[in-house]
C-alpha cells in the first residue's frame, strides 16, 4: 500500500508539472481537484513550486467556488487547502483498491492516475 | 521598501462629501488586497472596507454600507475611498492597509494616517 | 459578525516580565486570528498571523498560540520597546474583519 501511495504521489507531481504545458494533463486534474475538493499533492503550496505556472496562482480548480480567474493571486480562504494525494489515495484504497483489486504495478508511473469511469463514479457520489 | 501614503482628511460638515486617497509604492500594488481601518480619538481600530486586487470582491463595515465606496486604480497604484454623507461618528484617523497576499485581511503594512473631522 | 474579546483590558508590568494577553472569539475563527502592536501616534504594526506565525522583522520574544476561540499573545521577556497597545482581529468570517477593543500594556 506504500507503495502504491509513493507511486500515486510521484504521478500526481510528474502531472502537476506538465499543467501548463498539457491540456489534457491540465483538464485531468482540474477534474480532479474539484471533485475530489483539494489542491496539489501534498497542499494547495505544491503548485508554487511549479516553475511554469504563474506566480501567486493555484488553477482555478482549486477554488470552492470555481470562476474563471478565481486561482490568480487567490485568497487562502477560497481555496481547497487539503492535497491530492492524501484524499484521492484514501478513496482509491477505499473504493477501488479493495473493490477491483487493483494490483501494485497497475498504479505504474506511465499509467492513467484514476480512470475515467472511477472519476464518474466519485463525482455521483 | 514598502510604503503606503494617505491624503485627503479635511474638516468638513456633516452631510458633505469627502475622498480619501492612498499612494502605494515599492510593492506590486495589483496583487495585492488594500483595506481602510480608522480610529476615533482615544479609541480602538475599525475596519471600514476592504477590495480584492482586481476590484472583483469589495466589503464593508456596517457603519458605512451605503454611504462609503472603496476603489483602486492599479495604473496609478492607488486605493480611494469616496465618502459621502458623513456624520460626526466619521470623525477618525483613516489607515491605508496592504493585505497579505494569500491572507488577504491580514494587514501587514499599514499608513501614518489622515485626519478626517466631522462637524458643524 | 464575530466579536472579538481581549482581556485585560489593560496591564502593568515591568521590564523582564512575562506577559500573556489573551483574545477570544464569540465562534470558532480556526486559526484565522492576528495580533498588532500600536505605539502612540504610530500606525498600527503585524506582530503575528495566522495565531502562530511570526511576521518577518519581529522578534522572537513574540509568539502567539491557540485556536478555535481561545488565543493567547506571549511577550517572553518584556522589553522597553514593547510598551504600547496590542490589538486581535480576525480574518475568519468576513466581511467585517473585526479588531479586539485592544490591551493597553504600561510600565509598572
Known amino acids: 500500500r506504500d507503495k502504491v501511495m509513493s507511486e500515486f504521489n510521484n504521478n500526481f507531481r510528474q502531472q502537476m508539472e506538465n499543467y501548463p504545458k498539457n491540456n489534457h494533463t491540465a483538464s485531468i486534474l482540474d477534474r480532479m481537484q474539484a471533485d475530489f475538493k483539494c489542491c496539489g499533492a501534498a497542499n494547495y503550496t505544491d503548485w508554487e513550486k511549479i516553475p511554469s505556472m504563474s506566480k501567486n496562482r493555484v488553477p482555478d480548480s482549486c477554488c470552492i467556488n470555481v470562476t474563471v480567474g478565481c486561482g490568480i493571486n487567490f485568497n487562502e480562504k477560497a481555496i481547497h487547502k487539503e492535497g491530492c494525494v492524501e484524499k484521492i489515495g484514501g478513496w482509491l484504497r477505499k473504493n477501488v483498491l479493495e473493490q477491483k483489486l487493483i494490483s501494485e504495478e497497475d498504479l505504474g508511473g506511465e499509467q492513467k492516475l484514476i480512470s475515467e469511469e472511477d472519476l464518474h463514479h466519485h463525482h455521483h457520489h | 521598501e514598502v510604503q503606503l501614503v494617505e491624503s485627503g482628511g479635511a474638516l468638513v460638515q456633516p452631510g458633505r462629501s469627502l475622498r480619501l486617497s492612498c499612494a502605494a509604492s515599492?510593492?506590486?500594488?495589483?496583487?495585492?488586497?488594500m483595506h481602510w481601518v480608522r480610529q476615533a480619538p482615544g479609541k480602538g481600530l475599525e475596519w471600514v472596507s476592504g477590495?480584492?486586487?482586481?476590484?472583483?470582491?469589495?466589503g464593508y463595515a456596517d457603519s458605512v454600507k451605503g454611504r462609503f465606496t472603496i476603489s483602486r486604480d492599479n495604473a496609478k497604484k492607488s486605493l480611494y475611498l469616496q465618502m459621502n454623507s458623513l456624520r460626526a461618528e466619521d470623525t477618525a484617523l483613516y489607515y491605508c492597509?496592504?493585505?497579505?497576499?494569500?491572507?488577504?485581511?491580514?494587514?501587514?503594512?499599514w499608513g501614518q494616517g489622515t485626519l478626517v473631522t466631522v462637524s458643524s | 459578525d464575530i466579536q472579538m474579546t481581549q482581556s485585560p483590558s489593560s496591564l502593568s508590568a515591568s521590564v523582564g516580565d512575562r506577559v500573556t494577553i489573551t483574545c477570544r472569539a464569540s465562534q470558532s475563527i480556526s486559526s484565522y486570528l492576528n495580533w498588532y502592536q500600536q505605539k502612540p501616534g504610530k500606525a498600527p504594526k503585524l506582530l503575528i498571523y495566522?495565531?502562530?506565525s511570526l511576521q518577518s522583522g519581529v522578534p522572537s520574544r513574540f509568539s502567539g498560540s491557540g485556536s478555535g476561540t481561545d488565543f493567547t499573545l506571549t511577550i517572553s521577556s518584556l522589553q522597553p520597546e514593547d510598551f504600547a497597545t496590542y490589538y486581535c482581529?480576525?480574518?475568519?468570517?468576513?466581511?467585517?474583519?473585526?479588531f479586539g477593543q485592544g490591551t493597553r500594556l504600561e510600565i509598572k
Open positions: 515599492g510593492f506590486t500594488f495589483d496583487d495585492y488586497a
Open positions: 477590495i480584492s486586487w482586481n476590484s472583483g470582491t469589495m
Open positions: 482581529q480576525q480574518s475568519y468570517s468576513t466581511p467585517p474583519i473585526t
Open positions: 492597509g496592504k493585505g497579505l497576499l494569500h491572507q488577504w485581511e491580514v494587514l501587514d503594512y
Open positions: 495566522a495565531a502562530s
